[in-house]
Interface confidence: low
């Protein structure tokens, strides 16, 4: 029998590596691509703030452009999911409905209620995994039925894996002309909706552009350059490269404008005829084990997202204190650092890796002792690569709740950032009310003479806030905090505890026999390191 | 039966404005995006921008040769289509014609009805 | 902005001969292609889209082909109504380009 198919886009905003859209085309007489925009779910489930608002229409229009291309359309239809799945499925006479499998509990519970209104209107649901690399559920069955909580178990049981399965091949006008199109009309009926429409604040300078396109663009362009891929590593990236070092792909593996087995395999190919290459887990496939790594154990650790009633997690007494948390959020800490990189992140949706470090520790362990809970959610709207488990896995990972173990280690918000950018350029550029403060005091502007103040033509504590806390005496009281909560609660400590150092602090390793490089998978190369 | 017809071409001094109309019906205007496309005489078609529909809350795209001197309105009380010509030079000499682009069956977002046209000259 | 290119500027054919109008975009278009035809001293009319669509009304003797870069207008059974000029658009990206057209002669 021949469907009739709805296919719902969630995640999965691309048509390269699209295994239920490919299924949705292979089975059917005629496929309905669909986009739900549920705003009510999207708000209070997703979080998603302004940018990631204009991020995610910018990807609808994108994914109208390209289905466009190959003679179908995107239909964007607003409402609640469920009854907009119950009405069209009648509408329409569907007999499947086809979507990504996701793992947040969020879309767990939604592909639930839609197998439910199947079984009620009598319509088959097929749910394929294409945002991670691996079927968590199977590396979840090979540890026993509990995920590995340790990087390097991680890897163990991806060995036994071998390679994750490959990309499945695009659609293509001829899979698209196999199947009747949507009917007259309807693709201007459901127009992906402009961003006054929905009453978002107009775009800021957000460098990013959604869709799947812009994000193979910038994926050729950055493995164009084989040398730089096979030579990527974590620590040597500094956060004022304005043009991120990093791939600068990230907001487009959340959204799933890009496939993430895509990339691994292209990265597979380089790596095999690169001569000296980075080794995982400092190296571009070996973050995207990080990746899989927080996506395995948040799919199956209940309250993954919380502190309490987590069982990896610390549970830790933080301050509540609503006025340090604003601050910290406006950019109003009175260190230029956190401050630019806190600027940098509202204006732009993005902040460096190294930038997270600093402004998530400076959060909680190692200045404003506020819980990694309440910098998640302030990540969750601002990041445009904003991802349920990496963002939580990350928070716990850098308030030393969980998975990390140098826990001693605080970044100095003057230091540090003075010492990946000595002359301040990052600072000059998202704080320019201290552009004309001279290096020397471009970090620590509260220490230059009120006459160098004023000719820097600012006054701290009038044109810019004094620091909030003496980092020295804040970050020496959270530390005997911490060093407590870790005694008082050693067996949760242990639990994800790692005797692999985490990719900040890996030390660059390189291959240097004449072997060449083989397409070994990632987990294998990893146990070498 | 769709129907498109274009005014208010005509003889114009260089650095001049003209204001041409393309009045509309046999279809719901309001559903359509509507375009501007002029043809230079014995030369070819040359897409000018056009207007969205009200879904997309009649927002418009040009091309870079008149964007900024070029504005494409539309009265939708009235279903009549307006393209506003500022600054006019004696390359923009041509027939100028109205276009519908079809929604996505009939025509594919092709410009699937046209106008007959209205010339216009610049000229000193 | 992408360019399509009409090779022949002047084509020459004779009644009930078929004859191809060939269409080259400079850049990936997929299938967002169509044809115009224009006749001496009228407006243009659809005769495609989508690179292969017949437009309601047009005669099955028009046939297009072709995906991302190259396209073809194939009139079989020519008549002689279809001396006119031929036009190909892409309407894949902005600012939407036409060919430079193809005048079809009747021999």
């Known amino acids: 029998m021949r469907h009739r198919t709805i296919h719902l886009f969630r995640k999965g905003l691309r048509l390269h590596d699209n295994p239920a859209l490919l299924a949705a085309l292979q089975s059917s007489e005629v496929v309905y691509p669909v986009y739900i925009l549920d705003r009510a779910f999207m708000t209070s489930s997703m979080h998603i703030g302004a940018l990631r608002w204009h991020f995610l229409l910018q990807s609808l229009e994108d994914l109208r452009s390209s289905l466009r291309q190959l003679g179908s359309c995107l239909l964007v239809i607003q409402g609640e999911y469920e009854s907009v799945v119950r009405d069209h499925v009648q509408k329409w006479n569907i007999t499947q409905v086809t979507l990504d499998a996701e793992m947040e509990p969020f879309y767990k519970e939604m592909e639930a209620n839609i197998r439910g209104l199947g079984e009620e209107l009598g319509f088959q649901v097929l749910s394929l995994m294409g945002h991670s690399l691996y079927n968590t559920q199977r590396i979840l069955e090979l540890n026993g039925g509990t995920p590995p909580l340790t990087y390097k178990r991680f890897l163990r049981i991806l060995s036994l894996l071998g390679d994750p399965e490959v990309p499945v091949r695009n659609p293509t006008a001829e899979d698209f002309q196999r199947c009747s199109p949507p009917e007259l009309g309807l693709a201007e009926c459901y127009g992906v909706p402009l961003p006054t429409d929905l009453k978002i604040p107009p775009e800021s300078i957000s460098p990013w552009r959604g869709g799947e396109s812009e994000g193979l663009q910038r994926l050729e362009q950055h493995l164009a350059d084989q040398g730089w891929v096979a030579s990527f590593t974590k620590p040597k990236t500094v956060p004022n490269s304005l043009l991120p070092s990093t791939t600068g792909l990230s907001p487009y593996f959340s959204t799933g404008c890009l496939s993430v087995r895509s990339f691994f395999y292209r990265l597979s190919n380089i790596y095999a005829q690169a001569k000296h290459h980075s080794l995982p887990p400092v190296s571009l496939q070996g973050q995207l084990l990080w990746r899989e790594f927080f996506y395995t154990v948040a799919s199956a650790t209940p309250n993954f997202t919380k502190m309490a009633g987590n069982p990896i997690c610390l549970q830790i007494r933080w301050y509540e204190d609503a006025e340090r948390l604003h601050k910290w959020k406006t950019a109003q800490t009175g260190f230029p650092w956190i401050d630019a990189i806190m600027t940098q992140l509202r204006q732009e949706g993005w902040i460096h890796h190294l930038a997270r470090h600093a402004a998530a520790c400076f959060l909680t362990r190692g200045d404003l002792w506020i819980s990694w809970e309440e910098g998640m959610k302030v990540f969750e709207e601002l990041l445009l690569d904003a991802d349920y488990s990496i963002n939580a896995g990350n928070w716990m990972w850098l308030s030393a709740s969980a998975f990390f173990h140098h826990y001693t280690r605080i970044f100095c918000p003057v230091r540090f950032g003075r010492r990946t950018d000595p002359e301040g350029q990052y600072i000059r550029k998202y704080l320019p009310i201290l552009k004309n403060f001279p290096s020397k005091y471009i970090y620590e502007p509260w220490t230059a003479s009120e006459e160098e103040q004023k000719q820097a033509g600012c006054i701290i504590g009038r044109d810019y806030p004094f620091p909030m806390v003496d980092h020295k005496e804040a970050s020496d009281h959270n530390l005997q905090l911490m060093k407590q909560a870790r005694e008082e609660q050693h067996r949760i400590a242990q639990l994800t505890r790692d005797d692999a150092d985490d990719p900040m602090e890996m030390k660059l390793k390189r291959d240097h026999s004449e072997e060449s490089f083989t397409k070994t998978k990632a987990a294998r190369m990893t146990e070498q390191t | 039966e769709v129907k498109l017809e274009e005014s208010g071409g005509g003889l114009v001094q260089p650095g001049g404005s003209l204001r041409l109309s393309c009045a509309t019906s046999?279809?719901?205007?309001?559903?359509?995006?509507m375009s501007w496309v002029r043809q230079p005489p014995g030369k070819a078609l040359e897409w000018l921008g056009f207007?969205?529909?009200?879904?997309?809350?009649?927002?418009?795209e040009y091309s870079a040769s008149v964007k900024g001197r070029f504005t494409i309105s539309r009265d939708n009380s009235q279903s009549i289509l307006y393209l506003q010509m500022n600054t006019l030079r004696a390359e923009d000499s041509a027939t100028y014609y109205c276009?519908?682009?079809?929604?996505?069956?009939?025509?594919?977002?092709?410009?699937?009805?046209w106008g007959q046209g209205t010339s216009v000259t610049v000229s000193s | 902005d992408i360019v399509m290119t009409q090779s022949h500027k002047f084509m020459s054919t004779s009644v009930g001969d078929r004859v191809s109008i060939t269409c080259k975009a400079s850049q990936d278009v997929g299938t967002a292609v169509a044809w115009y035809q224009q006749k001496p001293g009228q407006s243009p009319k659809l005769l495609i889209y989508?690179?292969?669509t017949r437009h309601t009304g047009v005669p099955d003797r028009f046939t297009g082909s072709g995906s991302g870069t190259d396209f073809t207008l194939t009139i079989s059974n020519v008549q002689s109504e279809d001396l006119a000029d031929y036009f190909c658009q892409q309407y894949s990206s902005y600012p939407y380009t036409f060919g430079g057209g193809t005048k079809l002669e009747i021999k």
């Open positions: 046999g279809f719901t205007f309001t559903d359509y995006y």
């Open positions: 276009a519908r682009d079809g929604g996505y069956d009939d025509g594919g977002y092709a410009m699937d009805y």
């Open positions: 207007i969205r529909n009200k879904a997309n809350v009649y927002t418009t």
């Open positions: 989508w690179a292969s």
